[in-house]
């Protein structure tokens, strides 16, 4: 027989199957060109001295063989005597150590046995009832396939799975979805219902993120408020990178985790927009307001758990930057303007109360007045800061109030509301003898002293009822006692105390009469 032909004679070895565990297996035959065919198989066991024979039986019952020698792959043409247009039965017999080992048989029509393409192009990945669904367009003119997948994680080897039979222009597969680790998938196809047909190559890797994106482990720090009333939010720790399987390392579309920064400005609730979402890489500048910051991780399956931080308000105060004038029509605030066409947000809340009780007012965009000041006025009827108590005021400014990250702090300060001059009058003024010509005057702290920076000083006035002479003594706002000396015994005096702010003179307390008794010597 010619080597290129299938030999229709008895093979050159005895016909007996040893039934041993080793031997040929996994025979695959397919058409490789218009007129050529290839069969290949695996051989289990020691290969030394093994001769392989590809056996073929036609539908007529006639059988032939090709001698492959030690090779486990053999090509032949459509002129080799094998009927390619009709069904044939093929198997391999391996002659080794004086015994014959036989592979399982495959029955197929060689003419139509083409090697399929793997899924090509775009493989769409989605989540379906806790599983992974992959979908792709069937390669043209290859409808009718068996599909397998294999998958691995960064720490596990390949595992094989079955997608089942496919018979449409689109094919799909349900695969396991891991909760917390990324996976690499590959798919392959072969002709449906064709015994012994060859699997395609594996597809390109499909990289799939875990169902839950990793929780971002990041830390923030906030810089000091700068001269421009803004402070930078900086990232102290980058989010941990997802560990990827081997085929997904480098460029792995599909496994990307995106981290977004969600800012919620808690202060100034009357502004138009309170939240803004940014990319984590773009760290924003913030005003001195209080913020909640959340880092949201998400992948192609949606958002995961987020991590939230509270950034407290910057409480650094500027006691002199704000002027307040109280008139009969109402109250006006003045402060150094930031720039042209600025919107200001004035926020106030009673000191010592929950931050949720802040009230605010938004101005229309305004230009500086001739003195370079910005203003905000309100009437007594509005009730704004009308109670006689200490308020914490913060003024924010923005040229683009709709953009959350463009607000800056103009100033933060304290203000005593209502009729501060009367409310601040010191009470419980008492006079005690101190020496032969001096007394000690004490009083209870003014209500204004509860308001940091508001009380400028106390003034103690002493009036000599005989001569009508008056002396005034300034006292530090932190003190509530003064010693009046150079007094004369037997003279009647009255003493009063008032509390002044930077812009208001206080109301005198009720006059307190006293005198130093004349000492009689023995």
């Amino acid at each position: 027989c010619r080597t290129s032909e299938c030999c229709f004679q008895d093979p050159p070895y005895p016909d007996a199957d040893s039934g041993s565990a080793s031997g040929p297996r996994d025979l695959r035959c397919y058409r490789i060109s218009s007129d050529r065919y290839e069969c290949s198989w695996q051989y289990e066991g020691p290969t030394a001295g093994v001769s392989h024979f590809l056996r073929c039986c036609l539908s007529s019952g006639r059988c032939c063989y090709f001698a492959a020698g030690s090779a486990t792959r053999l090509q032949f043409s459509d002129q080799a005597g094998v009927s390619v247009l009709y069904t044939v039965t093929l198997w391999v017999e391996s002659w080794a150590r004086n015994q014959t080992e036989k592979s399982p048989e495959v029955t197929l029509q060689l003419y139509n046995s083409v090697k399929y393409e793997p899924p090509l192009g775009d493989i769409k990945v989605s989540k379906l009832a806790g599983q992974l669904r992959m979908e792709w367009e069937t390669p043209d003119n290859q409808v009718g396939a068996e599909v397998q997948f294999r998958h691995r994680t960064p720490s596990s080897p390949w595992k094989l799975g079955d997608c089942g039979p496919q018979d449409d222009d689109t094919e799909s597969c349900l695969c396991p979805l891991e909760m917390n680790v990324a996976q690499e998938f590959q798919l392959r196809r072969r002709q449906l219902g064709s015994q012994g047909s060859s699997w395609s190559k594996w597809s390109s890797p499909v990289c799939v993120p875990p169902e839950n994106p990793p929780q971002p482990q990041v830390r923030f720090s906030v810089e000091q408020l700068g001269q421009d009333g803004r402070r930078r939010l900086t990232l102290k720790e980058q989010p941990t990178q997802l560990e990827l399987p081997e085929g997904c390392q480098g460029l792995a579309p599909g496994t990307e985790v995106t981290y977004r920064l969600q800012l919620h400005m808690l202060s100034c609730p009357c502004k138009a927009k309170a939240t803004r979402t940014l990319h984590l890489g773009k760290m924003p500048y913030l005003s001195g307001a209080a913020y909640n910051v959340a880092v949201i991780s998400s992948n192609q399956f949606g958002p995961g758990l987020n991590q939230t931080w509270h950034i407290p308000a910057d409480t650094h105060t500027e006691p002199v930057a704000l002027n307040i004038s109280v008139g009969t029509n109402g109250t006006t605030m003045y402060w150094p303007a930031r720039a042209q066409s600025m919107t200001y947000c004035i926020e106030w809340q009673p000191v010592g109360q929950d931050g949720g009780l802040a009230t605010c007012s938004l101005t229309a965009p305004q230009d500086p007045d001739p003195a370079g000041m910005a203003t905000y006025s309100w009437s007594r009827e509005s009730g704004a800061m009308g109670q006689e108590k200490c308020y914490y005021i913060t003024i924010f400014a923005s040229a683009h109030p709709e953009k959350l990250t463009l607000w800056s702090t103009v100033l933060s300060t304290y203000h005593f509301g209502g009729n501060a001059s009367a409310a601040g009058t010191p009470h419980h003024v008492s006079v005690k003898n101190h020496s032969l010509d001096s007394v000690s005057v004490d009083w209870a702290p003014s209500l204004l002293s509860t308001c940091p920076g508001v009380l400028k000083e106390y003034v103690v006035r002493c009036r000599d009822e005989d001569s009508k002479q008056v002396s005034e003594h300034p006292v530090q706002p932190t003190e509530t006692q003064v010693t009046l000396s150079g007094l004369r015994a037997g003279v009647a005096y009255t003493v009063q105390v008032r509390a002044d702010t930077a812009w208001l003179r206080g109301v005198w307390s009720q006059p307190q009469r006293f005198s130093i008794e004349v000492q009689v010597s023995d």
Epitope: P139, N141, Q142, G144, L192
Partner: nanobody, 127 residues
Framework: EVQLVESGGGLAQTGGSLTLSCAAS????????MGWFRQIPGKDREPVGE??????????ADSVKGRFTISRANAKNTITMSLQMHSLKSEDTAVYYC??????????????????WGQGTQVTVSS
């Protein structure tokens, strides 16, 4: 459904050439192979050749081998199969039909294994 339309038939001289085309539209991705058959009055349809679309593998009947060539071109939702006929003989005179099959077990010599057919185009070879 798949629709097949042939074109290019006509009169040719002995020894001359002619090219037939077959345009397939509709659910073309599901077609496995397209072939040509011919028929002369009073006789059965006989195979000319076939092409397996995904690979471009061809089959030719012995009577046309070396003279006829089948090729295919794919566009979105349309496949065009061509039959180039050279060294034409008078016995090539027939109505030529384009056919398509969707099954992987079909035999290119058996007309009944093709699900879709064109309306046919006449080829006449005169001396």
């Amino acid at each position: 459904e798949v629709q097949l339309v042939e074109s290019g038939g006509g009169l040719a001289q002995t020894g001359g050439s002619l090219t037939l085309s077959c345009a397939a539209s509709g659910r073309t991705p599901s077609i496995v192979a397209m072939g040509w058959f011919r028929q002369i009055p009073g006789k059965d349809r006989e195979p000319v050749g076939e092409i397996i679309l995904s690979k471009g593998f061809t089959y030719y009947a012995d009577s046309v081998k070396g003279r006829f060539t089948i090729s295919r071109a794919n566009a979105k939702n349309t496949i065009t199969m061509s039959l180039q006929m050279h060294s034409l003989k008078s016995e090539d005179t027939a109505v030529y039909y384009c056919a398509a099959r969707q099954n992987w077990s079909g035999n290119p010599t058996r007309p009944n294994e093709y699900e879709y057919w064109g309306q046919g185009t006449q080829v006449t070879v005169s001396s």
